[in-house]
């Protein structure tokens, strides 16, 4: 949460931001709340992205003023028109992209004075449901040394991989992971464990995206001996 | 209501040009994209570009470049559609659509009713 | 530029039927994709946007889904004033794309 003030000069009045993550291709919010005004026609918003010289956006007089948008961002802002009256300034950022990650401002002007807050804006994509391979993947026994690969796709950015046992103990040993960027920028990962069998066992990863909070699960359970294993675990 | 109005049907020559007009009303025409889209006898839609008619910028088709121009007038909130060097393949039903999402360039919610445009010499 | 490939480009189907309908994009990934009917001689008619989103106003045996490349419209239970052309629209991007269309006709 990121609280600004105004500038001397006029009164000063507060702004807020709330620092955010948006999904790479869905739309994003940028947050910001300011003191209400009573006019509309006397409320500016103004959204500016350090390192870009047109505005993100801008908003005055009850509507939209776009002559000094940067054409990144062309067809891809709105404000919440009906609600700048009660102090809503958030912006609604359509097709999210790695680019549009950054530090903004959300300036404000009313009758009453002026405010400006920073927002750090993130950007990640989900990673998918991890897809989980056996190999050798039949005539497994106890005491066989196998290779589990978890496989995950198009995530941004870099994952966080854990493995863990059906008791919930983590497996840290005989971890290799790697992450490949694809003609995108988005990541791919695979993390392959190799693991001596006991009786039973089910063996977990969890692949962990570290700017949405998004976690994906995929396990594999290896039961009765001896067993033929399917190519592909369903789980 | 939103409404989008279209001028009527057109018959022009090969080589020639026609300018399509689409009247908006039911809301602020300034805040809105309006787009262009077509379709051919027995054919499928295909877009032709777009206008955000509060700053009159401009987006195409690479297909139609060179070839169309979208343009606006704000005071009587009508978007027009020209279409130059006119060829019998142009012969088609030109529609005007409103974009969704204000300055956000969104789905095309709201329809004219078409324009017939024939090309024949 | 981005092409949506639509498919089958027709399909017979009775009432009550499930139809199903689906647009590949060429590339990339968004959820910018919408759905519309379209009858004879009327401009098309828009169901869905952003994926999964009902038009208000729009029956609810109508659904949208789909990630990546590619998208679906569902009709749940076929109904006679459903038989018509259905178009996707890609408008994720800076130039729109329109998929070739399906016309869904009676059996």
């Known amino acids: 949460l990121i609280i600004g003030f105004g500038i001397s000069g006029r009164h000063s009045i507060t702004v807020t931001t709330v620092a955010s993550a948006g999904n790479i291709g869905e739309d994003g919010i940028l947050s910001c709340t300011f003191e209400p005004d009573i006019k509309l026609s006397d409320i500016v918003i103004q959204w500016l992205k350090e390192g870009v010289l047109g505005l993100v956006h801008e908003f005055k007089e009850g509507k939209d003023e776009l002559s000094e948008q940067d054409e990144m961002f062309r067809g891809r802002t709105a404000v919440f028109a009906d609600q700048v009256i009660v102090g809503n300034a958030s912006l609604r950022l359509k097709n999210v992209q790695l680019t549009d990650a950054g530090t903004y401002k959300c300036y404000i002007i009313t009758s009453k004075g002026k405010g400006n807050a920073n927002l750090e804006y993130k950007t990640g994509a989900p990673y998918s449901k991890p897809s989980m391979t056996l190999e050798p993947n039949k005539d497994l026994r106890p005491g066989d040394t196998v290779t589990i690969t978890c496989s995950s796709y198009r995530g941004y950015p870099e994952a966080e991989v854990f493995w863990q046992d059906g008791q919930g103990v983590p497996l840290t040993g005989n971890v290799t992971t790697s992450q490949m960027a694809n003609e995108q920028g988005l990541f791919d990962v695979h993390s392959v464990l190799r693991v001596v069998l006991g009786a039973n066992g089910t063996y977990s990863c969890l692949v962990r995206n570290p700017v949405l909070q998004q976690d994906a699960h995929g396990s594999v359970t290896i039961t009765g001996q001896p067993m033929t294993f399917p190519p592909e675990a369903l789980w | 209501e939103v409404q989008l109005v279209q001028s009527g049907a057109e018959v022009k020559k090969p080589g020639a040009s026609v300018k399509v007009s689409c009247k908006a009303s039911?809301?602020?025409?300034?805040?809105?994209?309006i787009g262009w889209v077509r379709q051919a006898p027995g054919q499928g839609l295909e877009w032709i570009g777009d206008?955000?008619?509060?700053?009159?910028?401009?987006n195409y088709n690479e297909k139609f470049k060179g070839r169309v121009t979208i343009t606006r007038d704000t005071s009587t909130s009508t978007a027009y559609l020209e279409l130059s060097s006119l060829r019998s393949e142009d012969t088609a039903v030109y529609y005007c659509?409103?974009?969704?999402?204000?300055?956000?360039?969104?789905?095309?919610?709201?329809w004219g009713q078409g324009t017939l445009v024939t090309v024949s010499s | 530029d981005i092409q949506m490939t639509q498919s089958p480009s027709s399909l017979s189907a009775s009432v009550g039927d499930r139809v199903t309908i689906t647009c590949k994009a060429s590339?990339?990934?968004?959820?910018?994709v919408a759905w519309y009917q379209q009858k004879p001689g009327k401009a098309p008619k828009l169901l869905i946007y952003?994926?999964?989103t009902l038009q208000p106003g729009v029956p609810s045996r109508f659904s949208g889904s789909g990630s990546g490349r590619d998208y679906t419209l569902t009709i749940s239970s076929l109904q006679p004033e459903d038989f018509a052309t259905y178009y996707c629209?890609?408008?994720?991007?800076?130039?729109?794309?329109f998929g070739q269309g399906t016309k869904v006709e009676i059996k």
């Open positions: 659509a409103r974009l969704d999402g204000s300055s956000y360039r969104g789905a095309m919610d709201s």
């Open positions: 039911g809301y602020t025409f300034t805040s809105y994209w």
């Open positions: 206008i955000y008619p509060g700053g009159g910028y401009t």
């Open positions: 590339q990339g990934f968004n959820k910018y």
């Open positions: 952003y994926t999964s």
């Open positions: 629209l890609q408008y994720g991007n800076l130039l729109y794309a």
